[in-house]
C-alpha cells in the first residue's frame, strides 16, 4: 500500500511573491498543496482541513487559524474554525469560502489543505435487513482466547449496546461527529440508525456470533443514520482515540474503520500516525468493485485493509458492485451473509454483507492474536494474519485481469493455536504502484518501518523494463523498478520480512566486460544471500545467457546478464541460514515456479536469464513465480529457456527462542 501514489486530485496553487501582510512568510521555495476528493459527488466544498507542518505546536496552529480568520475578514469573508487538531496531526478544520484557498495556502506552517469529503458504511444492504430467526447457533466455535486483554474501538454508526449479543461488552463513548442526514423527509428510526454498528460490534465480540467473544469494545459515532460520515469527523474520532490512549494507557488497541471514502491524503496520514503510536487499524477495502488504492483509509499502508469473500471463498458481489481488490488489500475475510446482532430487537439477528463485515472478522482475529501475544507489533501482527490465512483459494477470474497479480489470494483464518508461531521467519510481498509509461519512469515498493527488505524484483506486462535495484532512502532500503523505452510501465516488488537484529546491506557488481556474465556475492563474514536483483541501462538485453547453475560451493552468489549490474542483498542475523533453489525449463513457458519447502521461507525471487522476453519475477506466498512473454510470440528458440531462482531462508535463532519459551 502506497499512500503517496493514490489517484486523487491535487491542485497546487502556486504561492505569489507578495506576502499579503503576513508576519512570517512561508519557508522559501515550499509550496503548500490543495487536495480534494476525485469522486465529485462525495466532495464537501466549504469545509477544509488545513494540515500544518509536522513540528507545529498547538499554539501555532491556533495562531495560524486566527490569522486566517483575520485576513478573511479583511476581505469581507466569514470563516468558522470548527476544530483545532493536535495529538495526531497539527492543523485545523475550517468552514470558509473556496475563494480563500489561495490565501490559506500562503499561511505560515501550512503543509497542505484538503477539502472535506464523505465516507460511507461498507455494508449492503445495511438498512434493508433480511431478519433471521432470533436464534443463532455457533456451537462449534469456542475460541481458545476471546481477546479479553484487548480493547477494540469501533468508528461507525450509533449502536444498541445493550443487545443481548453484546451487553456489557461495548462502552459507548460520548464521541459523536456526524453530518446531517440527507433529504427533508428523512425519518430517524432508532433501530435503523444503530443497524450497521450493532451488527459489526456483534461480529467482533458478540457472545454467540462474535469472533473475539472476550474483547471489550468502545464505540465512536462517526456515521449518521444513513451510514454517512465525513473525513473530518473520522479524523477527529482518530484524534479522540489517540488522546484517550495518552490519558489512560491500556493494553493493545485495535481500531476498526468499517467505512470508506475517496482517496484522502489527510485521513491516510492520521492513520499512519496512530499506527506508529502502536495502534492496530483495520479497515474495509470498500464495496466499489474497484482498486482499493483509490479509497481511504483502505489505501493507507499502515492500515490492515480487508476485502470480502463468501462461504465458497469467492470475492463478494454486492448488487452491480462488489469487494474492492488490488495491491492495497492485505487479505480477504468472510463478508457475505454474515449473521450478527440486529438492532430490530434485543435478541434479533440479521445477515449483512460487505467489506465492513470482513474487516470486523479481521479485527476480531487481531484481538485474539494480541490477547495471546500482547507485545506483537503491527508488522508482526500483519505478517501473522498473512501467514495463517488460507492461500490460493480465491477464484482470481473475478478480478480485472490487470489486478489479479496484485491482489493477495489470502482469506483470513484464526491461527490453529494462538501461541507458538514465534519461531517462523515471516515474509510478505509488497507491490508498488504502477510506474506509468514514460521512458524514465520508476516505481518504488517499501517495507514497513520494522520490516527488513530482503529482496527486490520487478514486473512489466509488456516485458519492457530495465530491471530493479535496492537503494537507500531515508535510512531504509527501498525497491525501485525501472521502465524501459516503449514500455507500458513497471511494478517494483519488495519482499518484506521480520528479522530481528538483522544487519543487511546491498552489494553491487557493475556490468561485466567479459562474456561470462555479471556475478556478485556476499563476502562479509556471517552474511548470507537473501535476494538478487539486476538493473540495466540498455533498452534491450541481448540473448546472452549466463551459466544458469552456480559453480559448486557458491551459494552466496547472484548471477546475471553481462550488460546488467547485479545487486545482492546480504544479511547477518542470529541463526539465519539461506539456500538457493532453482527450477529451469528448457522449453519456453509462460510461467515457471519454484517453491521453498516446509520450514523455509521465500526471501528472494528472480529470473535467469534477465533477457527481454522475461516479464519479471515475484513472490506469491512461498513460491517464486517467473513470468515470460506469450510462447506464441517468443517461438520455441532456446531464448525461451527460463529459470526461476528462489532464495529460501530460515532462522535457527527464532526456532530456539520459541522452544525455550515452550
Amino acid at each position: 500500500q502506497e499512500d503517496e501514489d493514490g489517484d486523487y486530485e491535487e491542485l497546487v496553487l502556486a504561492l505569489r511573491s507578495e506576502e499579503d501582510g503576513l508576519a512570517e512568510a512561508p519557508e522559501h521555495g515550499t509550496t503548500a498543496t490543495f487536495h480534494r476528493c476525485a469522486k465529485d459527488p462525495w466532495r464537501l466544498p466549504g469545509t477544509y482541513v488545513v494540515v500544518l507542518k509536522e513540528e507545529t505546536h498547538l499554539s501555532q496552529s491556533e495562531r495560524t487559524a486566527r490569522r486566517l480568520q483575520a485576513q478573511a475578514a479583511r476581505r469581507g469573508y466569514l470563516t468558522k474554525i470548527l476544530h483545532v487538531f493536535h495529538g495526531l496531526l497539527p492543523g485545523f478544520l475550517v468552514k470558509m469560502s473556496g475563494d480563500l484557498l489561495e490565501l490559506a495556502l500562503k499561511l505560515p506552517h501550512v503543509d497542505y489543505i484538503e477539502e472535506d469529503s464523505s465516507v460511507f458504511a461498507q455494508s449492503i444492504p445495511w438498512n434493508l435487513e433480511r431478519i433471521t430467526p432470533p436464534r443463532y447457533r455457533a456451537d462449534e466455535y469456542q475460541p481458545p482466547d476471546g481477546g479479553s486483554l484487548v480493547e477494540v474501538y469501533l468508528l461507525d454508526t450509533s449502536i444498541q449496546s445493550d443487545h443481548r449479543e453484546i451487553e456489557g461488552r461495548v462502552m459507548v463513548t460520548d464521541f459523536e461527529n456526524v453530518p446531517e442526514e440527507d433529504g427533508t423527509r428523512f425519518h430517524r428510526q432508532a433501530s435503523k440508525c444503530d443497524s450497521h454498528g450493532t451488527h459489526l460490534a456483534g461480529v467482533v465480540s458478540g457472545r454467540d456470533a462474535g469472533v473475539a467473544k472476550g474483547a471489550s469494545m468502545r464505540s465512536l459515532r462517526v456515521l449518521n443514520c444513513q451510514g454517512k460520515g465525513t473525513v473530518s469527523g473520522t479524523l477527529i474520532g482518530l484524534e479522540f482515540i489517540r488522546k484517550s490512549q495518552l490519558v489512560q494507557p491500556v493494553g493493545p488497541l485495535v481500531v476498526l474503520l468499517p467505512l470508506a471514502g475517496g482517496y484522502s491524503r489527510v485521513l491516510n496520514a492520521a492513520c499512519q500516525r496512530l499506527a506508529r503510536a502502536g495502534v492496530v487499524l483495520v479497515t474495509a477495502a470498500g464495496n466499489f468493485r474497484d482498486d482499493a488504492c483509490l479509497y481511504s483509509p483502505a489505501s493507507a499502508p499502515e492500515v490492515i485493509t480487508v476485502g470480502a469473500t463468501n462461504a465458497q471463498d469467492q470475492p463478494v458481489t454486492l448488487g452491480t458492485l462488489g469487494t474492492n481488490f488490488g495491491r492495497c488489500v492485505d487479505l480477504f475475510a468472510p463478508g457475505e451473509d454474515i449473521i450478527g446482532a440486529s438492532s430490530d430487537c434485543s435478541t434479533c439477528f440479521v445477515s449483512q454483507s460487505g467489506t465492513s463485515q470482513a474487516a470486523a472478522h479481521v479485527a476480531g482475529i487481531a484481538a485474539m492474536m494480541l490477547s495471546a501475544e500482547p507485545e506483537l507489533t503491527l508488522a508482526e501482527l500483519r505478517q501473522r494474519l498473512i501467514h495463517f490465512s488460507a492461500k490460493d483459494v480465491i477464484n482470481e477470474a473475478w478480478f480485472p485481469e490487470d489486478q489479479r497479480v496484485l491482489t493477495p489470494n489470502l482469506v483470513a483464518a484464526l491461527p490453529p493455536s494462538t501461541h507458538g508461531a514465534g519461531w517462523q521467519l515471516f515474509c510478505r510481498t509488497v507491490w508498488s504502484a504502477h510506474s506509468g509509461p514514460t521512458r524514465m519512469a520508476t516505481a518504488v515498493a517499501r517495507c514497513a518501518p520494522d520490516e527488513e527488505l530482503l529482496s527486490c524484483s520487478s514486473f512489466s506486462r509488456s516485458g519492457k523494463r530495465r530491471g530493479e535495484r535496492m537503494e537507500a532512502q531515508g535510512g531504509k532500503l527501498v525497491c525501485r523498478a525501472h521502465n524501459a523505452f516503449g514500455g507500458e510501465g513497471v511494478y517494483a516488488i519488495a519482499r518484506c520480512c521480520l528479522l530481528p537484529q538483522a544487519n543487511c546491506s546491498v552489494h553491487t557488481a557493475p556490468p561485466a566486460e567479459a562474456s561470462m556474465g555479471t556475478r556478485v556475492h556476499c563476502h562479509q563474514q556471517g552474511h548470507v544471500l537473501t535476494g538478487c536483483s539486476s538493473h540495466w541501462e540498455v533498452e534491450d538485453l541481448g540473448t546472452h545467457k549466463p551459466p544458469v547453475l552456480r559453480p559448486r560451493g557458491q551459494p552466496n552468489q547472484c548471477v546475471g546478464h553481462r550488460e546488467a549490474s547485479i545487486h545482492a542483498s546480504c544479511c547477518h542475523a542470529p541463526g539465519l541460514e539461506c539456500k538457493v533453489k532453482e527450477h529451469g525449463i528448457p522449453a519456453p513457458q509462460e510461467q515457471v515456479t519454484v517453491a521453498c519447502e516446509e520450514g523455509w521461507t521465500l526471501t528472494g525471487c528472480s529470473a535467469l536469464p534477465g533477457t527481454s522476453h522475461v516479464l519479471g519475477a515475484y513472490a506469491v506466498d512461498n513460491t517464486c513465480v517467473v513470468r515470460s512473454r506469450d510462447v506464441s510470440t517468443t517461438g520455441s528458440t532456446s531464448e525461451g529457456a527460463v529459470t526461476a531462482v528462489a532464495i529460501c531462508c530460515r532462522s535457527r535463532h527464532l526456532a530456539q527462542a520459541s522452544q525455550e519459551l515452550q
Epitope: 436464534r135 445493550d162 451487553e167
Partner: antibody, heavy 115, light 107 residues
C-alpha cells in the same frame, strides 16, 4: 460499586396496579438492559421480561403480555415495572437484575395483593 | 421455552462435604448457564457465570462445569454459610428460565 436499588414494599387490592422502580448505579447503564424476575412465596424464580435503558425496547415473557409494562428513564438511570389488573397470585417478591445475564440483582420489592 | 431440570430438589450434607448439583436443559444452551445462591429473605447472588466462570469475590470452593445440555455445580468443601437454595438459569434464549432450585440443608 454496581448497585440496583428498588422501591419499597407495596400492598394492593385485586384489580389495582403497582409500579416498582429500580435505580441503577456504578456502571454505564446503556450497556445493559434491566430484567425483571419475580418469586412467589415458597416458589422458584420466574423471568418476566427485559427493558432497554438505551432505547426503551422491551422483551416480555408471554405470560406477562398485556398486563405488564416495563419502561426506563435514562436521565435518572431508573427502570420501572408496572403490573395492572393485579390478582392474588401476583403476590411475590419482584426483583430487578442487570441485563439478560442477571449478574447483579436488586434487593427485591414485596408486592402483596390482598382484598 | 427451554425447560431447566435441577436435581436433587433437596439434599442434606455436613460441613466439609463435597456437594454436587446437576442441571439439565431441554435443548442445547451452549454455555449460557448461571448458578445462583439464595438465602431466605435475600436476593439471589451470582455464583457461576457462563457455566464455569466464577465472578470476583466468590470463594474458590464453588465451581461449575458442563456445556450443551448438562451442567454441574460443585461445592468442594461445604461451609456453614453455604446452606441455602441454589438455582440454575439459562440465558441462551428468551424467556430466561430457571431450574426449580436445590435446597442444601444441614444433616
Amino acid at each position: 460499586q454496581v448497585q440496583l436499588v428498588q422501591s419499597g414494599a407495596e400492598v394492593k387490592k385485586p384489580g389495582a396496579s403497582v409500579k416498582v422502580s429500580c435505580k441503577a448505579s456504578g456502571y454505564t447503564v446503556t450497556s445493559y438492559g434491566i430484567s425483571w424476575v419475580r418469586q412467589a412465596p415458597g416458589q422458584g424464580l420466574e423471568w418476566m421480561g427485559w427493558v432497554s435503558f438505551y432505547n426503551g425496547q422491551t422483551n416480555y415473557a408471554q405470560k406477562l403480555q398485556g398486563r405488564g409494562t416495563m419502561t426506563t428513564d435514562p436521565s435518572t438511570s431508573t427502570a420501572y415495572m408496572e403490573l395492572r389488573s393485579l390478582r392474588s397470585d401476583d403476590t411475590a417478591v419482584y426483583y430487578c437484575a442487570r441485563g439478560y445475564s442477571l449478574d447483579v440483582w436488586g434487593q427485591g420489592t414485596t408486592v402483596t395483593v390482598s382484598s | 421455552d427451554i425447560q431447566m431440570t435441577q436435581s436433587p430438589s433437596s439434599l442434606s450434607a455436613s460441613v466439609g462435604d463435597r456437594v454436587t448439583i446437576t442441571c439439565r436443559a431441554s435443548q442445547n444452551i451452549n454455555n449460557w448457564l448461571n448458578w445462583y445462591q439464595q438465602k431466605p429473605g435475600k436476593a439471589p447472588k451470582l455464583l457461576i457465570y457462563g457455566a464455569s466462570t466464577r465472578p470476583t469475590g466468590v470463594p474458590s470452593r464453588f465451581s461449575g462445569s458442563g456445556s450443551g445440555t448438562d451442567f454441574t455445580l460443585t461445592i468442594s468443601s461445604l461451609q456453614p454459610e453455604d446452606f441455602a437454595t441454589y438455582y440454575c438459569q439459562q440465558w441462551d434464549d428468551t424467556p430466561n428460565t430457571f431450574g426449580q432450585g436445590t435446597k442444601v440443608e444441614i444433616k
